[in-house]
Interface confidence: medium
């Protein structure tokens, strides 16, 4: 995947110190806590008479560096110590000897917010490029993990979920996954910027929370997506059910209140009874399911439980909070943050009137 | 402001060695390089070397090069330019200039050199 | 060494004229970015001023009658409104390798 650019290049080059050693990069570069950036940079110089056989060697600088005193962010020039804090994300891509000075920061930290000039030398030619500068912005990380399931979720059938970070760089440290679930799960394959989970969910599971959770260990972040996993049971006959699927193969999520209202003229009384049972199995169920961690994607597992705010428990319950099977819809109660996956069972088309909104599970 | 300001005139016997100084001032004397060039009495420009301070790097046209010694003291931003074995035809009017890189931005006033037995 | 042919060696022309004085190295002296061609001017009894480095960059403070052009081997000098103070004589300079060498110089007078 390409470095991540986020911001429009705002060029400049500097004129006004030197004409003659001028310099083109972006005054401003956007980047998200714990992803990373490659900004262009060309710049130019004079090679004189005397130094037209010797190596350059280029320099990124904090503003304010004393050059003689404080070491580069990043430099070509091996035996230059560079900043603690920058090492190994802070690079020197360009090769100064071509004019190119660009810049890669990946696992980008807060504490990497400010101004950075570039310097050159080459023999006895030597430059601090103090204008244009370029001006680093690290925002928080907004970007939140997918979470792909493949079909329908089956009691009793394995289901590959993968959890993937496709907006992450290649460059920076890979990512740390961990999967939070109360249904019996495995770690599959993971790469870079993905993991697998193996579910084999229950009756019960259906409603519970499944969390992946991404820590971008190089700068020290987190992001995550909740979701509900959506069990779907499917009867002996399977010419009978309520809702059938579009065919899509998307695990569809939806706010407020699940519609489960039986109508219609041919509808027996033996569905409104498997309606009924399913609704008092998972009621039962649900109480006692508790959420779990099942594993991590990374070299370096970690112990302990939950933070707090993973261990709410999600409630599915009636208006009336009673067993009863009136066919008045159960409703779904959840963090705010959390998407819903809908009651989806096999044989009836909902109402046309419905007024819900419909969203896919692998958001933005 | 820069100023470069050069030792007074000189007039030297054939064989016999001068020494020329130029004494920077308004700015960083070891950030640039430092040349010497002469003219002769009605003819054009002729380079003779130059050094650079920071790192003590020199260069010399190859007519100068067992003559002449470049020089600087950083301690008084002063740069010198030494030339032995004078014959009549080192008369000149001797110039030192200032190099950010390759042109010469400041030059000092001159130097008459006047060799003559 | 490179050889520096400067043309012609002296003019006369009258205030408001276009001047154009060229200087032809023996080898190039330009690179992809840079020309390393430079031009001064020495008025009688003074030191040699910059007016233009690598070829066509104007010194500052050098009024911009003068400018300058050219890349490779041949390289001009233009003012293009001669005025009474530029009476002096012109010289080009490479700074492309040691030793650096100048033009024999263009002696220009004012009609």
């Known amino acids: 995947m390409p470095l991540l650019l986020l911001l429009p290049l705002l060029w400049a080059g500097a004129l006004a110190m030197d004409p003659n050693f001028w310099l083109q990069v972006q005054e401003s570069v956007t980047v998200q806590e714990g992803l990373c950036v490659l900004v262009p940079c060309t710049f130019f110089h004079p090679i004189p008479y005397y130094d037209k056989n010797s190596p350059v060697h280029g320099y990124w600088f904090r503003e304010g560096a004393i050059i003689s005193r404080d070491s580069p962010v990043a430099t070509n020039k091996l035996d230059q110590e560079v900043q603690e804090e920058t090492q190994g994300r802070f690079r020197l891509l360009g090769d100064p000897s071509r004019n190119n000075c660009s810049l890669s920061i990946v696992d980008a930290r807060r504490r990497d917010n400010g101004s950075y000039f570039f310097r050159m030398e080459r023999g006895s030619t030597k430059y601090s490029y103090k204008s244009p500068q370029l001006s680093v912005h690290v925002t928080d990380l907004t970007h939140r993990p997918k979470i792909l399931i493949p079909g329908t979720l089956e009691p009793g059938h394995s289901k590959n979920l993968t959890c993937s970070v496709s907006w992450a760089c290649e460059q920076g440290t890979p990512p740390i996954f961990s999967w939070l679930s109360a249904a019996p799960t495995s770690l599959g394959p993971r790469t870079t910027h993905s993991s697998v989970l193996i579910i084999t969910p229950r009756p019960q599971d259906h409603g519970t929370n499944l969390t992946c959770q991404v820590k971008f260990a190089g700068a020290g972040v987190t992001t995550e997506r909740t979701i509900q996993l959506n069990v779907t049971y499917v009867p002996q006959n399977p010419t009978t059910g309520i809702f059938p699927g579009d065919g899509s193969g998307k695990q569809e999520t939806r706010a407020g209140v699940v519609h489960g209202a039986i109508g219609g003229a041919g509808v027996t009384a033996l569905l409104a009874l498997c309606l009924c049972l399913i609704f008092f199995i998972v009621k039962t169920h649900r109480r006692k399911a508790a959420r779990t961690a099942v594993g991590r994607n990374d070299t370096h597992p970690t112990t302990g439980s939950a933070s707090p705010k993973h261990q709410k428990k999600s409630k599915l319950h009636g208006p009336t909070e009673t067993s009863s099977c009136s066919g008045a819809a159960p409703t779904v109660e959840m963090d705010e943050e959390l998407h819903y996956a809908s009651l989806n069972f096999h044989g009836m088309n909902p109402s046309k009137d419905t007024s819900t909104e419909y969203s896919e599970v692998r958001t933005q | 402001q820069v100023q470069l300001v050069q030792s007074g005139a000189e007039v030297k016997k054939p064989g016999a060695s001068v020494k020329i100084s130029c004494k920077a001032s308004?700015?960083?004397?070891?950030?640039?390089?430092y040349h010497w060039v002469r003219q002769a009495p009605g003819q054009g420009l002729e380079w003779i070397g130059f050094?650079?301070?920071?790192?003590?790097?020199?260069g010399y046209a190859q007519k100068f090069q067992h003559r002449a010694t470049l020089t600087v003291d950083n301690s008084t931003s002063t740069a010198y330019m030494e030339l032995s074995s004078l014959r009549s035809e080192d008369t000149a009017v001797y110039y030192c200039?200032?190099?950010?890189?390759?042109?010469?931005?400041?030059w000092g006033q001159g130097t008459l050199l006047t060799v003559s037995s | 060494d490179i050889q520096m042919t400067q043309s012609p060696s002296s003019l006369s022309a009258s205030v408001g004229d276009r001047v154009t004085i060229t200087c032809r190295a023996s080898?190039?002296?330009?690179?992809?970015?840079?020309?390393?061609m430079h031009w001064y001017q020495q008025k009688p009894g003074k030191a040699p001023k910059l007016l233009i480095k690598?070829?066509?960059n104007l010194e500052s403070g050098v009024p911009s009658r003068f400018s300058g052009s050219g890349s490779g081997t041949d390289f001009t000098l233009t003012i293009s409104s001669l005025q009474p103070e530029d009476l002096a004589t012109y010289y080009c300079?490479?700074?492309?390798?040691?030793?650096?060498?100048f033009g024999q110089g263009t002696k220009l007078e004012i009609k």
């Open positions: 690598y070829a066509s």
């Open positions: 300079q490479h700074s492309w390798e040691i030793p650096l060498t």
């Open positions: 200039a200032r190099s950010d890189v390759d042109y010469f931005d400041y």
């Open positions: 050094i650079y301070p920071s790192n003590g790097i020199t």
């Open positions: 080898q190039s002296v330009s690179a992809s970015t840079y020309s390393y």
């Open positions: 308004g700015y960083t004397f070891t950030d640039y390089n």
